[in-house]
């Protein structure tokens, strides 16, 4: 004799996150009397998704009207699918019974796979700035995607990088996955305007990858070069000495003039000029009253950049000699004075 069969025609269904999944099920008979129930998973831990007889299932709608006479279509729709809904769904016929309905026949199951887009990649750089020629690490993270297959690439100013390591977690089966990648980047003095880009490609993105960026301006520190020069006499007893602070980044910079080791003036870089590469130049000058000195004067331009230890450049001013214009070389080189770098 023919007995009721529960038919789930689809072995698997693939749905994008946020969409509605249709799980098909038909019975071949109206007998025995009793409800159809849908479960996710099998065995004692299975999760009830829908019960024709009773309960409230706000995300579930039936494809056909189950109150209609002769209805044998027990297909359901589950709305607003998330990766957590992935699993195998079983359509199960129960037989009316006392005190409880009795499971009579189960369908073969339909595996619901959820395609979920990866989150926008987040790129983060090192906590502290680094100087050119140093290698720094950038990390890129993206979460919540499914299936597991994903491609991640790194670029610096459009050029693909090769020195990186990528992990997709977890290793085993999961409702959704995360990717974590670390790339190593060698800084150059020209990197103030550079960008590091992490690009993620996934089947859900239909060939339009997601990108996360980090500006190297947040990472790089370009230390300044100093040049101290003596300018032509402005008045009979005055000499103008300038300190050129070149090619530095970021702008945060404090300059101190010392006369024979004593602080003469301290100022903070304000009206800087920007170079094409994004670094800054700044110039400070000091008017020295020669008549106030009996001996030679050692002038030092001391610069503290971005909280780093100070660097300095010195210039010897000979009081006895008639002031004359110095060339572009430092006075220290002309006079044999020591250049002092303080670390």
């Amino acid at each position: 004799e023919e007995e009721l069969q529960v038919i789930q025609p689809d072995k698997s269904v693939l749905v994008a996150a946020g969409e509605t999944a249709t799980l098909r099920c038909t019975a071949t008979s109206l007998i025995p009397v009793g409800p159809i129930q849908w479960f996710r998973g099998a065995g004692p831990g299975r999760e009830l998704i829908y019960n024709q007889k009773e309960g409230h299932f706000p995300r579930v709608t039936t494809v056909s009207d189950l109150t209609k006479r002769n209805n044998m279509d027990f297909s359901i729709r589950i709305g607003n699918i998330t990766p957590a809904d992935a699993g195998t769904y079983y359509c199960v016929k129960f037989r009316k019974g006392s005190p409880d309905d009795v499971e009579f026949k189960s369908g073969a199951g339909t595996e619901l796979s959820v395609r979920a887009k990866p989150s926008a990649p987040v790129v983060s750089g090192p906590a502290a700035r680094a100087t050119p020629q140093h290698t720094v690490s950038f990390t890129c993270e993206s979460h919540g995607f499914s299936p597991r297959d994903i491609t991640l690439k790194w670029f610096k100013n459009g050029n693909e990088l090769s020195d990186f390591q990528t992990n997709v977690d977890p290793v085993g089966e999961s409702v959704s996955y995360s990717i974590h990648s670390t790339a190593k980047v060698v800084l150059t003095r020209e990197d103030v305007h550079s960008q590091v880009i992490c690009e993620v490609a996934h089947v859900t993105l239909q060939g339009d990858p997601l990108r996360g960026t980090a500006n190297l301006s947040e990472t790089i520190r370009v230390p300044p070069t100093l040049e101290v020069t003596q300018q032509p006499v402005r008045a009979e007893n005055q000499v103008n000495v300038t300190c050129q602070v070149r090619k530095f980044y970021p702008q945060r910079l404090q300059l101190t003039w010392l006369e024979n080791g004593n602080v003469s003036r301290t100022e903070t870089a304000s009206t800087v000029t920007e170079n094409k590469d994004g670094t800054y130049n700044w110039m400070s000058w000091l008017l020295v009253n020669v008549s106030a000195h009996r001996d030679d004067v050692k002038l030092t331009c001391q610069v503290e950049h971005d909280g780093q230890p100070a660097v300095s450049k010195s210039h010897d001013l000979k009081v006895s000699a008639h002031p004359k214009e110095q060339g572009s070389n430092t006075a220290a080189e002309n006079t044999g004075s020591n250049e002092r770098n303080i670390y």
Partner: antibody, heavy 113, light 111 residues
């Protein structure tokens, strides 16, 4: 659906009633039997589906048996008594979301000595 | 075992009247909605009106309606027509598949 086989029988003489169906498959639908004694109300007897899905009301167990072919369903009154005198109806359906509908016109069984 | 108590056992009404028949189960019916209503005219087979407590059967006029859940159910005829004079039965289903029980019937007669 249409019933047949109703007649006058003496007490204790087994009687088989037949419900002949058309327009639907008996592999998909149960057939329920209901009777109505003269001037009385309706009384549910049982439902005949597949072999394992045949059941009778508690009062009817042992007094009736059921069987079916591809187009007919039989109800056998194993040992009729005068109390079994009634019009016997068969109907497609097995209750709850599959109610009894349509019904046959009925067949009269009279048990008398 | 389920017991279905129908009331009244009979009533007299006029064409156009609103008629209400109640059916009470001794315990909750299966799924709280295993309750059907049937109409029977003399010498005829019963005819399905309502099932699942409130679902109107195909071809049944909309003046018939069913309500209720659990143990208490009502059949309402909103505007009685001459062809509605008949006997009405409720059929309740218990948790056991063989536990289907009719109420004793309500005869609706012309006043």
């Amino acid at each position: 659906v249409e019933e047949s086989g109703g007649r006058l029988v003496t007490p204790g003489t087994p009687l088989t009633l037949t419900c002949t169906v058309s327009g639907f498959s008996l592999s998909s639908h149960g057939i329920s039997w209901v009777r109505q004694a003269p001037g009385k109300g309706l009384e549910y007897i049982g439902t005949i589906g597949t072999g394992v899905i045949t059941y009778f009301a508690s009062w009817a167990k042992g007094r009736f048996t059921g069987s079916k072919t591809s187009t007919t369903v039989d109800l056998k009154i194993t040992s009729p008594t005068t109390e079994d005198t009634a019009t016997y109806f068969c109907a497609r359906g097995s209750a709850w979301n599959d109610p009894f509908d349509p019904w046959g016109p009925g067949t009269l069984v009279t048990v008398s000595s | 075992e389920l017991v279905m108590t129908q009331s009244p056992s009979s009533l007299s009404a006029s064409v156009g009247d609103r008629v209400t028949i109640t059916c009470q189960a001794s315990q909750s019916v299966y799924g709280n909605n295993d309750l059907a209503w049937y109409q029977q005219k003399p010498g005829e087979a019963p005819k399905l009106l309502i099932y699942l407590a409130s679902t109107l059967a195909t071809g049944v006029p909309s003046r018939f309606s069913g309500s209720g859940s659990g143990t208490d159910f009502t059949l309402t005829i909103s505007g009685l027509q001459s062809e509605d004079f008949a006997t009405y039965y409720c059929l309740g289903g218990g948790d056991d598949e063989a536990d289907n029980v009719f109420g004793q019937g309500t005869k609706v007669e012309i006043k």
